[in-house]
């Protein structure tokens, strides 16, 4: 076990809607620390939502991703640890506005951190169940997420945290599917990705294609919000307190105040740099931005968070 | 407009193999998935699993693992479908269907191919 | 896996007749349905998805409600061209699961 910093390194200020179980790879809870208890989902896409544990469906999805982390490891699913090199890069984004995406250090970790890991690589992120990951939080994991038609028809009502790079350590995030690929669902602005490798475990029966390019943000979009369309609004507000502010999608009531505070834990330096993670920002229907991304390549995994600088929020508002 | 055109009709014998393409045309072909499903003659559907092109992973119904194979080209954006080993109770009409990222349903569809399996 | 149970299999009713069709999944599915229909010879045609919600180009005739474990397609005022099979796919997770479909033929 891994007994990380206690202090809260994710804080939901909104909980998302409901999003199917086949699209989720993993979950962990928030430290107890947080002081509102969620549920962080992560999806195929590699993007995380908070939710709400008192809700039917997320004990329902919890559930199923236990089984599915359980049966994998039963199937003789093994850990692999990946360590990643993050780059700082500029990638347009949906939404008008320049969001600064920096990973800032809030605690030593043990040396068994949160790391990158290519998005196209799932196949390859520990399986098994850990009771603690590195910051204190638990988790399981599982299945993985589908794409979706149009944009302008929405994406889940819900608060995404922020875009995650696919993450493995060894005994902590872990995913029962072979992959867990797909177009950037919300938040739809990504640095390029890096060739896929096939996942060994699906053999024969896996498919084989070039490597995996751009999405485009306009595509691959419906809604989970049971009949309702996003409405996205174009504010974004900074909050000034607390670890970073990272950008939350409400996907229905998406609007102000949908934050999510992100603390980082510094990678541990073993291994070598494998390919750069993903980093998105917000999603919106419209318009193009660069997303800049600064961090210290060797030092920072995982938790890549979208926060608007000051001339942004006041652009938008 | 968006449209998936499929291969056509093939007779098989008894453990040999059968490939199917599905070619994608009037959206981004890497923005999607792709799930193909079958139904046998008089039949109700049946999910056989779905691709993603961006990167070609796949994922499949644990009754088709194993001799199922998902494919696909970016270049042509086309997607396949290999069944091996087919048995007879493999005849049914094939067909790739295009799935959004926010769910697995099936928002627009080819227009099937016919596998006769017999000896 | 869940299992999808659809009823009446078959249903004989006249243009202009209200017609329902239900859905049963041995688990709850959260609202995580899809509705098809699909006529002789053809491939199914994306009608409702997350339950009620109409695709594109579906007329307002169609609707869908239920949660939980039982939903419903309703045809308010049937048409000619309405006559067809119907199938419901749950995608709440995997494997999906359809209905074993419902005909609506001709009274």
């Known amino acids: 076990q891994h007994h990380g910093v206690t202090k809260c390194n994710i804080t939901c200020s909104k909980m998302t809607s409901k999003i199917p179980v086949a699209l989720l790879i993993h979950y962990q809870q928030n430290q107890a620390s947080c002081g509102k208890r969620a549920i962080i989902l992560e999806t195929r896409q590699h993007r995380l939502f908070c939710a709400d544990p008192k809700e039917q469906w997320v004990k329902d999805a919890m559930q199923h991703l236990d089984r599915q982390a359980a049966a994998l490891t039963r199937n003789g699913g093994t850990f692999e640890k990946q360590i990643g090199e993050v780059k700082p890069r500029t990638t347009p984004a949906a939404g008008g506005m320049d969001e600064s995406v920096v990973l800032e250090p809030e605690a030593t970790g043990e040396s068994s951190s949160l790391e990158p890991t290519p998005s196209s690589q799932e196949a390859q992120r520990a399986l098994g169940t850990s009771p603690e990951l590195p910051t204190g939080v638990t988790g399981s994991s599982g299945t993985r997420l589908p794409p979706t038609p149009k944009a302008q028809d929405g994406g889940p009502v819900g608060t995404e945290l922020f875009r995650v790079p696919p993450v493995s350590t060894a005994a902590t995030w872990q995913s029962s599917a072979p992959h867990q690929p797909g177009p950037s669902l919300w938040a739809e602005a990504k640095t390029s990705e890096a060739p896929s490798t096939q996942d060994p475990s699906t053999q024969a029966s896996t498919a084989s294609s070039p490597a995996p390019e751009e999405n485009a943000p306009s595509e691959g979009q419906r809604v989970w919000g049971q009949g309702q369309s996003p409405r996205p609004e174009n504010s974004l507000e900074r909050e000034e307190m607390g670890p970073v502010p990272a950008h939350t999608d409400a996907f229905q009531d998406w609007g102000p105040g949908s934050m999510a505070h992100v603390s980082v834990v510094p990678v541990s330096s073993e291994g070598t740099p494998s390919r750069e993670p993903v980093a998105s920002g917000s999603w919106t229907p419209k318009a193009e931005e660069p997303i800049h991304a600064t961090m210290d390549p060797q030092r920072l995994g995982v938790l890549i968070t979208p926060v608007p600088d000051a001339q942004a929020a006041t652009r938008r508002q | 407009q968006v449209q998936l055109v499929q291969s056509g009709a093939e007779v098989k014998k008894p453990g040999a193999s059968v490939k199917v393409s599905c070619k994608a045309s009037g959206y981004t072909f890497t923005n999607y998935y792709i799930h193909w499903v079958r139904q046998a003659p008089g039949q109700g559907l049946e999910w056989i699993g779905w691709i993603y092109p961006g990167d070609g992973s796949p994922k499949f119904n644990e009754r088709f693992k194993g001799r199922t194979t998902l494919t696909a080209d970016k270049s042509t954006s086309t997607a396949y479908m290999e069944l091996s080993s087919l048995r007879s109770e493999d005849t049914a009409v094939y067909f790739c269907a295009r799935g959004p990222t926010d769910g697995d349903y099936f928002d627009y569809w080819g227009q099937g191919t016919t596998v006769t399996v017999s000896s | 896996d869940i299992q999808m149970t659809q009823s009446p299999s078959s249903l004989s009713a006249s243009v202009g007749d209200r017609v329902t069709i239900t859905c049963r999944a041995s688990g709850n599915i959260h609202n995580f349905l899809a509705w098809y229909q699909q006529k002789p010879g053809k491939a199914p045609k994306f009608l409702v998805y997350n339950e009620k919600t109409l695709a594109d180009g579906v007329p307002s005739r169609f609707s869908g409600s239920g949660s939980g474990t039982q939903y419903t397609l309703t045809i308010s005022s049937l048409q000619p061209e309405d006559f067809a099979t119907y199938f419901c796919?749950?995608?709440?997770?995997?494997?999906?699961?359809f209905g074993g479909g419902t005909k609506v033929e001709i009274k």
């Open positions: 796919q749950q995608f709440w997770s995997t494997p999906y699961t």
